[in-house]
Each structure stands twice: as structure tokens, then as C-alpha cells.
Interface confidence: low
């Protein structure tokens, strides 16, 4: 015998309370495949999350982040605070890149300048907090006295890579450090 629920298309659920009639998903819920016995609650984009794609009866909503934050994680499960170029996010907020490192984006960590001498090249343009050095021809290709050697990049300070970053995700935009996961979303009910 064919399961009567298999006839229920996406956007509906097989309602056991009504003789397995295919009922439309209630507001703020969806089913992306046919034959479902329940509809899933739509993802909601609150706080620093912004709706990129509205929920429909057949597909979940998609979120991105409000200005000043960027997405992290699968499906933008977290929003991380932007920093300026030349900075990285630490647990004390945005901090300037230390000497010998740079970051040319609003996210991520400061990375050491390229060591031109490792490739047998010289520094053509000095590095800054925002930009890597530009390596030029090798010293041998230059006339005597014209060579320039970059000092080796300093070792990164221990613990200066991203620590306890300002991540904000959906579950509980509700205490003290802003480090939240999406785990309990399915518990939220419309009331």
C-alpha cells in the first residue's frame, strides 16, 4: 500500500490529526520536500542578522549581517564584527596589526609581510598595516648599493590570532559575552 503522505507536496505536511490530509504549512514554517509529517519553523533574522531571502512555504529564510558585521559559518550562522583594514579582531575588540604584519580586509587576522629575501628578491615598496610589501627584482639584478633587504617579520605574539571573537548568532541574542550558537532555533515558537 502506498503511504498517503507521499502525495503531500513541498509546502504542506501530512496532518495525522486530520486523516492524513495534506495541510499547508502554517505561517512562519516550511517544508522543502514532499511527504513531510511536519513543517520546520522558519529561520528568523533578528538583532544583527538581516533577512537576505524571506521564508516561503517551501524554503527556509536566509540571513546575512547588518552593516558593521560579516557572516561566518555555514549559512551565515554567526555574525562577526568588522574591523578596519590594518586591524584584526581580538577578544578586546579591533586592534591594529603589530609591526611587520598587515590585513587588507575588514575581517580575518593580521598576516606577516612577505619576506622578499626568501625568494631572493628585494623590497620594492615597504609594507604597512594595511598592505603587504611589494617585492622587486633580486638584489643581484640591481646596481651595486641599490639593494634593499627587508628585516625578517617578527614572530607573532602568542595568542594574537583570533581569540574568543565577537560572534553573534541566532539562538539567544539574550548576556555578557557575545558568543552564541544557533543550536536552539528549532525550539522557538510563534506566540
Amino acid at each position: 500500500l502506498q503511504d498517503p503522505c507521499s502525495n503531500c507536496p513541498a509546502g504542506t505536511f501530512c496532518d495525522n490529526n486530520r486523516n492524513q490530509i495534506c495541510s499547508p504549512c502554517p505561517p512562519n514554517s516550511f517544508s522543502s520536500a514532499g511527504g513531510q509529517r511536519t513543517c520546520d519553523i522558519c529561520r528568523q533574522c533578528k538583532g544583527v542578522f538581516r533577512t537576505r531571502k524571506e521564508c516561503s512555504s517551501t524554503s527556509n529564510a536566509e540571513c546575512d549581517c547588518t552593516p558593521g558585521f560579516h557572516c561566518l559559518g555555514a549559512g551565515c550562522s554567526m555574525c562577526e564584527q568588522d574591523c578596519k583594514q590594518g586591524q584584526e579582531l581580538t577578544k578586546k575588540g579591533c586592534k591594529d596589526c603589530c609591526f611587520g604584519t598587515f590585513n587588507d580586509q575588514k575581517r580575518g587576522i593580521c598576516r606577516p609581510w612577505t619576506n622578499c629575501s626568501l625568494d631572493g628578491k628585494s623590497v620594492l615598496v615597504n609594507g604597512t598595516k594595511e598592505r603587504d610589501v611589494v617585492c622587486g627584482p633580486s638584489p643581484a639584478d640591481l646596481s651595486p648599493g641599490a639593494s634593499s633587504v627587508t628585516p625578517p617579520a617578527p614572530a607573532r605574539e602568542p595568542g594574537h590570532s583570533p581569540q574568543e571573537q565577537k560572534l553573534i548568532s541566532e539562538e539567544d541574542l539574550g548576556g555578557e559575552q557575545k558568543l552564541i550558537s544557533e543550536e536552539d532555533l528549532h525550539h522557538h515558537h510563534h506566540h
Partner: antibody
Framework: EVQLVESGGGLVQPGGSLRLSCVAS????????MNWVRQAPGKGLEWVSY????????YYAGSVKGRFTISRDNAKKSLYLHMNSLRAEDTAVYYC??????????????????WGQGTTVTVSS | DIQMTQSPSSLSASVGDRVTITCRAS??????LNWYQQKPGKAPKLLIY???SLQSGVPSRFSGSGSGTDFTLTISSLQPEDFATYYC??????????FGQGTRLEIK
């Protein structure tokens, strides 16, 4: 009827401990995030602590962190606040409050939509 | 943390008056702003959520408006039961949940 009822308040000496309870009725307690909010005599509202519906995520105000512990027992429809190392400045009416979630057309809003009647904690020698 | 500042701290008005209370956030909170009413010896009661949405059971003489950093709660025609303290609360960036310091509405 949707209701929250607190208990456990009383007079305690500085450095002492108390455990507040909040019992829910009229709604599916395990589906809701919960908060404790307090109000010192003649003062405004101050958020104290938060717990997610499953109890996996917890937050505290800086003024109580390390001294207070929030917990919940969904089977008993109960929320708790364990208060240690109490100080005179913890004297207040303590309210438990349900965090209601409201689906807007685009966003997901929340507000403290159900409050208990409050229980009074007095810290004095 | 986001700071919420209400004004005035207290105000006197008469039954039938139109009353406006303002709340300012220290940074933009979009429309993530709630208003509560508290009567002496009682728990706070949610009046308005999402800046302008009236909570179920709240009389229509209450209304909220605003977005970003500036919000208002308006009571169009004051009734005797409306004399109370009113609090705004942001729900944009939490924790912590932060409230305004309150506005006490008294009978003139």
C-alpha cells in the same frame, strides 16, 4: 492562564545565600527562554540573568557574575536563581520573566511578555 | 552595552491629556524597542514591542513610534489607570538586556 510565580525571597545576612524559584503554568515552559530581572527599592529595572530554553546558553550581568547561578528544570516547569555571597546592593524585588518571541514580516523580535509577581530579597545585618 | 535614556524622568498630567514619553538609544537599534508599564507594587507589563506593535490586550490609546535611536510612547487620552512608571528596553544587542531609567507619570 499563563502565569509565573516566584518564591524563595527573604532576609539574609551579607555573605549569605538564597535560592529563588519560579514556577510556570499555562504554557510550554521548555519552549521559552527565561530571564531574571530585579528592582532595587525606589529604582529602575535591572536585568540579572538569562537562560536559553534548553539551558545550554546562560548569561549574567557583570554585577552578579561569579556569585549567582541560573538554572532550569523543564520537567518541573521551574526556573531557579542560586544567589551566593550576597551584598547589601543585591536587595531588590526579583522577577522572573518569559522572553516571548514575535515573528515580524522580516525580523524576529523579542520582549519580556510574561512576568511573575516578584519575590523580595533583603540583604542586611 | 547600549544605553537607554528616557525623558522626562517624571511628568504630571491630567485625565484626558495627550502624553508623550521619549527614549533615546546610545546607538541605532533599528526598531528593536519595547515599552513596559509598571504600577506601584506590581510587576512590569509589556505594552509595545518592536517600537510600534501593540501587545495583545493593551488599549489602543497607547502607541509607539520611532526607529534608529529616537523613540516615543504616546498615550492619546490619559485614563486614571494609566498613572504609572514607564520603561523602554532595547532588544537589538543583547545581552545584556538594557532598560531606560523609567518615567514616572503622576496625576496633576
Amino acid at each position: 492562564e499563563v502565569q509565573l510565580v516566584e518564591s524563595g525571597g527573604g532576609l539574609v545576612q551579607p555573605g549569605g545565600s538564597l535560592r529563588l524559584s519560579c514556577v510556570a503554568s499555562g504554557f510550554t515552559f521548555s519552549s521559552y527562554e527565561m530571564n531574571w530581572v530585579r528592582q532595587a527599592p525606589g529604582k529602575g529595572l535591572e536585568w540579572v540573568s538569562y537562560i536559553s530554553n534548553s539551558g545550554t546558553t546562560i548569561y549574567y550581568a557583570g554585577s552578579v557574575k561569579g556569585r549567582f547561578t541560573i538554572s532550569r528544570d523543564n520537567a518541573k516547569k521551574s526556573l531557579y536563581l542560586h544567589m551566593n555571597s550576597l551584598r547589601a546592593e543585591d536587595t531588590a524585588v526579583y522577577y522572573c520573566a518569559r522572553e516571548g518571541t514575535i515573528f515580524g514580516t522580516v525580523h524576529y523580535y523579542f520582549a519580556l511578555d510574561v512576568w511573575g509577581q516578584g519575590t523580595t530579597v533583603t540583604v542586611s545585618s | 552595552d547600549i544605553q537607554m535614556t528616557q525623558s522626562p524622568s517624571s511628568l504630571s498630567a491630567s485625565v484626558g491629556d495627550r502624553v508623550t514619553i521619549t527614549c533615546r538609544a546610545s546607538q541605532s537599534i533599528s526598531s528593536y524597542l519595547n515599552w513596559y508599564q509598571q504600577k506601584p507594587g506590581k510587576a512590569p507589563k509589556l505594552l509595545i514591542y518592536a517600537a510600534s506593535s501593540l501587545q495583545s490586550g493593551v488599549p489602543s490609546r497607547f502607541s509607539g513610534s520611532g526607529s534608529g535611536t529616537d523613540f516615543t510612547l504616546t498615550i492619546s487620552s490619559l485614563q486614571p489607570e494609566d498613572f504609572a512608571t514607564y520603561y523602554c528596553q532595547q532588544s537589538y544587542s543583547t545581552p545584556p538586556i538594557t532598560f531606560g531609567q523609567g518615567t514616572r507619570l503622576e496625576i496633576k
